[in-house]
Interface confidence: medium
């Protein structure tokens, strides 16, 4: 708490300006009116206050708005936002995308802080869903934002918002997240033609089921190895050698370099060696000729 002391004669602030930058902590507390500060918050950003001084200014706003700041103040917080705690932010009701953008700009270039995460959470919950404009904004500032959401949270993303997603936004997503996003992407891009569709859907294919991969193999898509390596193992295993060859096109040669890594390794173990040999890549580890393959999982399902 800052001690209450009388403002020295002639030091009362009539406006928020740079004459305040060398005020001592107690002088700021005594000489700056909180209501004045609230109406001139936009000026704070042009004045190089020290961290200690920012703490005093925050304290004044906290006293003025104990239930949480109004959006008119929040929008102009600028770098004072960096002084807010998640607890402070939970008191806010942020509804304007402009306010969100203004505060994200302050944190630009830094990792997503707990403050920013709380702000985004409050904003998205207030809107009810992650609409396209919000998602556009969030992924512009934090490319990994989508992948920081739980599958449950991702379920609130409308398919129309998927158009805002760039490949790099999905770099850190795990299979569970892609399982949720893929059907949305499939729906979003369903009216596109073959090659355009593949370009858009490619980043989401880590959530694709076997039947969709089979369908893609009939469309001459020439999937690259990096995309293939991110596919769900359980979706790749049922694919035949011919289907994988069609799916990868000229990239099929890359299988050799990946034969010890999933999902290629597990897929090889499921193929007949004869079939693998037709690729001419020297892939080893398939089922020897003359062996009978029993699909026990199918047998269990039937019984």
């Amino acid at each position: 708490e800052v001690e209450k002391t009388a403002c020295p004669s002639g030091k009362k602030a009539r406006e928020i300006d740079e004459s305040l930058i060398f005020y001592k902590k107690w002088e700021l507390e005594a000489c700056v009116d909180a209501a004045l500060l609230a109406t001139q918050m936009d000026r704070v950003n042009a004045i190089p206050f020290t961290y200690e001084q920012l703490d005093v200014l925050k304290h004044k706003l906290d006293e003025l708005y104990p239930q949480g700041y109004p959006e008119s103040v929040i929008q102009h917080l600028g770098y004072l936002f960096l002084k807010m705690s998640p607890e402070d932010i939970r008191k806010w009701n942020v509804t304007s995308l402009e306010t969100l953008k203004a505060l994200l700009e302050v944190n630009k270039g830094h990792e997503m802080s707990p403050q920013v995460a709380t702000l985004i959470d409050r904003f998205v919950k207030g809107r009810g869903q992650l609409d396209k404009d919000t998602l556009d904004t969030l992924t512009a500032f934090y490319p990994g934002y989508l992948c920081s959401l739980s599958p449950e949270e991702l379920s609130s993303v409308p398919p129309s918002s998927i158009w805002a997603v760039r490949p790099q936004d999905l770099d850190t997503c795990d299979p569970r997240q892609l399982d949720v996003l893929y059907p949305k992407a499939r729906l979003a891009f369903q009216n596109m033609n073959g090659s355009e569709y593949f370009v858009k859907i490619q980043s989401f294919l880590g959530g694709a089921p076997t039947e969709d991969l089979k369908a893609l193999s009939q469309q001459n898509v020439s999937m690259d190895l990096a995309t293939f390596m991110k596919l769900r193992t359980d979706a790749v295993l049922p694919l035949t050698v011919a289907e994988v060859q069609k799916l990868l096109g000229p990239h099929v040669e890359g299988l050799k370099a990946e034969e010890r890594h999933r999902p290629v390794r597990d897929w090889i173990l499921r193929q007949r060696q004869d079939d693998l040999d037709t690729l001419g890549l020297g892939l080893q580890g398939g089922i020897p000729n003359g062996y009978l393959v029993l699909d026990l999982s199918m047998q269990e399902a039937l019984s």
Partner: antibody, heavy 121, light 106 residues
Framework: EVQLLESGGGLVQPGGSLRLSCAAS????????MSWVRQAPGKGLEWVSA????????YYADSVKGRFTISRDNSKNTLYLQMNSLRAEDTAVYYC??????????????WGRGTLVTVSS | IQLTQSPSSLSASVGDRVTITCRAS??????LAWYQQKPGKAPKLLIY???SLESGVPSRFSGSGSGTDFTLTISSLQPEDFATYYC?????????FGGGTKVEIK
């Protein structure tokens, strides 16, 4: 090129005066608060004085208060330090330094090469 | 606010991990910067806000800490890293620097 170039250093007798200048280029000078930092021979760094972007606010370390005056001419992109009543302990390399823009960024991302002030009889 | 750096000097070899500490006489939040200075040269900003790496500074430099205790770490010392390192607080006026830590070749 973004740079700061100090001048005006030299040998002066105790009680004498000296005016240091710092010419800035490559950035919007008036947008930044500026400081003088000094370093006595073989010693550490000491912050001496600072001035706001417009020149309307100034601050001094206790060791130089009342003797040194910081000022700036934004039309000439130049920072000054007027040093009066100089003492032997003011002997140092004087650096002019640009501080980061807000928030509270009173640290220095650009320094001049420094100018040596020697106070000796 | 007084800043106390330790050690005042240290000898290390290329490839070593080097740690320098800076202790503030009172809490300064994360308002701490680290500089590198080579003989006859001006200081160069390495770290600000206790842990943010200045643009163009190699990633082998890192900073940590908050409140009163701070650390500068060089993960793998390179020949060009032999210099004197200073911490500086910018929480309040007057701005103050630590006494410096000289990193020498063993």
């Amino acid at each position: 090129e973004v740079q700061l170039l100090e001048s005006g250093g030299g040998l002066v007798q105790p009680g004498g005066s000296l005016r240091l200048s710092c010419a800035a280029s490559g950035f919007t000078f008036s947008s930044y608060a500026m400081s003088w930092v000094r370093q006595a021979p073989g010693k550490g760094l000491e912050w001496v004085s600072a001035i706001s972007g417009s020149g309307g606010s100034t601050y001094y370390a206790d060791s130089v208060k009342g003797r040194f005056t910081i000022s700036r001419d934004n039309s000439k992109n130049t920072l000054y330090l007027q040093m009066n009543s100089l003492r032997a302990e003011d002997t140092a390399v004087y650096y002019c330094a640009k501080n980061r823009p807000p928030p509270g960024y009173w640290y220095f991302d650009l320094w001049g090469r420094g100018t040596l002030v020697t106070v000796s009889s | 606010i007084q800043l106390t750096q330790s050690p005042s000097s240290l000898s290390a070899s290329v490839g070593d991990r080097v740690t320098i500490t800076c202790r503030a006489s009172q809490g300064i939040s994360s308002a701490l910067a680290w500089y590198q200075q080579k003989p006859g040269k001006a200081p160069k900003l390495l770290i600000y806000d206790a842990s943010s790496l200045e643009s163009g500074v190699p990633s082998r430099f890192s900073g940590s800490g908050s409140g009163t205790d701070f650390t500068l770490t060089i993960s793998s010392l390179q020949p060009e890293d032999f210099a004197t390192y200073y911490c500086q607080q910018f929480n309040n006026y007057p701005l103050t620097f630590g006494g410096g830590t000289k990193v020498e070749i063993k």
